[in-house]
């Protein structure tokens, strides 16, 4: 019988008492085969973290700073359940740390040196740790003691709870630096008042502070937020302009064998029986013998943290950067305006080989990082382990939802002004063998399908989106008799046609021979009835253009396109017979890397782009024997996006809507994780 006990860790007598009450009340409402609570008492949160890591306890609820500690080796804990605040309809699991300024003050985030600062309190998250952590490498050396460095960075501050004797500048704006509400500039409202009164130039608070202190929109409009990219935004655009997004209070567990499903089952049942306004005799979110015992008193309920989400992703790049800077205190030798090498994310060993060659030729400008799937690469870019990669539109959508931005677009047509003219897109098509003359768009049911990969534009999002509109369900593996759609569940019929060996079967990378455009077409040639690819795929792999044994004798005339009106047309008539127009592949990165990725890639394409004529004696960035490694092989240049610099603007309203409709069919664990952080 599996042990269905969750050992909750308590850090005080009062918490232990509440835990025992929790245990007893749960026993009274949950059947004997359901989850139960046991209580483990430790002296501190750090002791609880160690106990969970050592399998002496299973769960504890932590503030963000401690979630970071819990994640660090050797603890390796992960977030499993989040407390939420506000309403069930609009649950808030995060708050945003922001830098508020007066509208007419005219400076940016990178111009804070010499300004006057207002903080909620020394050592507090939004008011100190996050802003000072992010500014850490701009502080004058020596950076220890930290208070001295901060005092020398700003021209004056109010940092309640600081030592006014040792660091008088930190108390210059609020004499005495009182550590309670007796100090008018203490806490969130106090720090905002410090700005409002004109004592300070910037207040470090949380996003709700402005709304709580200024009910009137006209008054709020006198203030702005400083963004990390050195722009400003209105105060209500805090989701796009903040210093960090911080989880409020989170249950953590072991990463391996951590009972996360059991913990969720327990807490979900607990909130049903003892949540807000549920029971008089025991309340989960109430602490008669103290404050915030086990859970925050202000919490309204729990939400399950998506399983794909580790602590780094949950806490977010900015928060992790700030806390790491403060804890480790390491900065680059001398902060320069020069760009660091761009860490390119390569999929599997084939892309890694090409990336390595690029890296050698780039003379220090490009480094390589490997991952097994596109989603793993996106996650690495999010958390700073990698910086950039080029993505199909379907993954540009996921990357965008995860906070990444497009920087340059692949262009596929030769033109005089390639780099300045991003193209409208390419065509997603359905290809069949000419010999299968009875096959049309309307009778694909029961046929064998070949897809570039799940989640990709031409191979999945467009054809499956159109199909979904017809069949109104997501069971595509029942619609086709079998197929190869790399990234599908291994036991799905949509992995049956794939050719990868062993663990590589149906993997969404080049270890699966039927992956990508060329792979999907090969799947059609060898096994399938229909391939969903781009309009250039057939000409690129026929007429001897692909020397691989399977392709070298193929003839374009032996293939036709399926049109949505039920007719068929020759391959060259793609402009009048396609499923939809697809946005070109694009390079994505984090917002903080945008300028450097743009600059370095433009240099790199001038050195190794399509202007290089002899690829046998020179490295060519856009060549890989029809395998589309790192970039599509038909890329002519990487083009500027001009104002299409968000994923929505880049992909266009129509495509975003189409992918949004398919979301109900999505199997993307990363998309689920990212929409948890930003619904």
């Amino acid at each position: 019988v599996p042990d269905k006990t969750v050992r909750w860790c308590a850090v005080s007598e009062h918490e232990a008492t509440k835990c025992q009450s929790f245990r007893d009340h749960m026993k009274s409402v949950i059947p004997s085969d359901g989850p139960s609570v046991a209580c483990v008492k430790k002296a501190s949160y750090l002791d609880c973290i160690r106990a969970i890591a050592a399998n002496e306890a299973d769960a504890v609820t932590l503030d963000a700073g401690l979630v970071y500690d819990a994640y660090l080796a050797p603890n390796n804990l992960k977030p499993v359940v989040a407390e939420f605040y506000g309403s069930k309809e609009d649950p808030q699991t995060f708050y945003y740390a922001v830098a508020v300024v007066k509208k007419d003050s005219g400076f940016q985030m990178n111009q804070l040196r010499g300004k006057k600062s207002c903080h909620t309190g020394l050592g507090r998250s939004a008011g100190w740790n996050i802003p000072i952590g992010l500014l850490y490498c701009d502080l004058p050396e020596p950076r220890k003691p930290l208070e001295k460095a901060v005092a020398n960075f700003f021209s004056g501050s109010c940092a309640p709870c600081a030592d006014g004797t040792d660091f008088p500048q930190l108390c210059q704006l609020c004499p005495g630096c009182g550590c309670s509400t007796l100090n008018q500039y203490f806490g969130y409202s106090g720090a905002f008042k410090c700005l409002k009164d004109g004592a300070g130039d910037v207040a470090f608070v949380k996003h709700s502070t402005i709304f709580e202190n200024l009910a009137n929109k006209a008054d709020r409009d006198q203030y702005e937020l400083l963004c990390l990219d050195n722009t400003r935004k209105p105060v209500d655009e805090y989701k796009d302009c903040h210093l960090a997004q911080v989880p409020s209070h989170t249950v953590v567990a072991r990463s391996m064998g951590g009972k996360e499903d059991l913990i969720w089952e327990l807490l979900n049942q607990a909130q049903e029986h003892f949540g807000k306004d549920k029971s008089k005799e025991f309340q989960l979110f109430s602490s008669p013998h103290g404050k915030d015992l086990l859970f925050k008193d202000s919490a309204h309920g729990f939400l399950k943290v998506p399983p794909r989400m580790d602590a780094k992703m949950y806490l977010g790049y900015e928060y992790v950067t700030a806390i790491r800077n403060l804890r480790e205190g390491t900065c680059p030798e001398a902060p320069t305006d020069e760009c660091k090498p761009v860490k390119w994310c390569a999929l599997s060993h084939h892309e890694r080989l090409k990336c390595d060659e690029w890296s050698v030729n780039s003379v220090g400008k490009i480094e390589c990082v490997s991952a097994e799937t596109t989603e793993d690469c996106i996650a690495k870019i999010m958390n700073g382990e990698a910086d950039a990669m080029s993505l199909d539109g379907g993954f540009v959508y996921i990357a965008g939802k995860c906070g990444l931005v497009p920087v340059l677009a692949e262009n596929y047509n030769k033109s005089d002004n390639c780099e300045d003219t991003p193209e409208a897109g390419y065509f997603a098509i359905a290809v069949v063998k000419k010999s299968a003359s009875d096959l049309t768009w309307d009778n694909l049911k029961g046929k064998k399908s070949c897809h570039t990969a799940v989640g990709r534009t031409a191979g999945w999002n467009i054809p499956m989106g159109l199909l979904y509109n017809k069949i109104n369900h997501c069971r595509f593996d029942e619609f086709f008799s079998e197929g190869c759609a790399p990234g599908s569940k291994k036991d799905s019929s949509l992995c049956k046609l794939c050719m990868g060996s062993g663990l590589n079967l149906c993997e969404p990378n080049n270890k699966e021979g039927y992956y990508g455009y060329t792979g999907a077409f090969r799947c059609l040639v060898e096994k399938g009835d229909v391939a969903f690819v781009k309009h250039q795929t057939v000409p690129q792999n026929t007429g001897g253009k692909n020397p691989d044994p399977w392709a070298k004798n193929l003839n374009e005339k032996d293939y036709e396109l399926l049109c949505l009106d039920g007719t068929r047309k020759p391959v060259e008539e793609y402009a009048n017979c396609h499923l939809a127009r697809a946005p070109n592949h694009a390079v994505v990165t984090r917002k903080d890397k945008e300028a450097c990725v743009h600059k370095i890639l433009r240099q790199q394409q001038h050195l190794f782009g399509s202007n290089v004529t002899d690829c046998s004696g020179n490295f060519c960035l856009f060549r890989s024997e029809t395998k589309d490694l790192l970039f599509r092989d038909d890329t002519v240049c990487l083009a500027k996006l001009h104002d299409r610099n968000t994923y929505e603007k880049y992909l266009g309203e129509e495509y975003v809507k189409a992918v949004g409709n398919l979301r109900k069919c999505s199997t993307s664990s990363l998309l689920e994780a990212c929409t948890f952080r930003r619904p």
Epitope: E357, V360, N361, V363, G617, N618, S624
Partner: nanobody
Framework: EVQLVECGGGLVQPGGSLRLSCVAS????????MAWYRQAPGQQRELVAG???????KYADSVKGRFTISRDNAKNTLYLQMNSLKPEDTAVYYC???????????WGQGTQVTVSS
């Protein structure tokens, strides 16, 4: 198609030196990039050092300052001078010229380097 053969490996004590050679069956003068990789048991193959036709070099962080890559186009040979060897340098070392594409598994026999006291 140029064939590459690695040699020069062996057993060496920590702190010792070895010089690996990779001899090509044809001219390497026009080859854009040549590189040394290594693979330890149970590990992925990793780039150790690379050199371009123009002589620009790149090294893995773990070998910087200890290893030197060079090519002699007249002798159609790629070299890897390995100094201050450490136990963690133990692996099979392979050379490549990337000319057979990134897709086929075209690695040669490699040469075993063992660093042990």
């Amino acid at each position: 198609e140029v064939q590459l053969v690695e040699c020069g490996g062996g057993l060496v004590q920590p702190g010792g030196s070895l010089r690996l050679s990779c001899v090509a069956s044809g001219s390497i003068a026009s080859i854009a990039t040549m590189a040394w990789y290594r693979q330890a048991p149970g590990q992925q193959r990793e780039l150790v050092a690379g050199i371009t036709r123009g002589g620009s070099t790149k090294y893995a962080d773990s070998v910087k300052g200890r290893f030197t890559i060079s090519r002699d186009n007249a002798k159609n040979t790629l070299y890897l001078q390995m100094n201050s060897l450490k136990p963690e340098d133990t692996a099979v070392y392979y050379c490549t010229d990337y000319s057979r594409g990134y897709y086929q598994d075209y690695w040669g026999q490699g040469t075993q380097v063992t660093v042990s006291s």
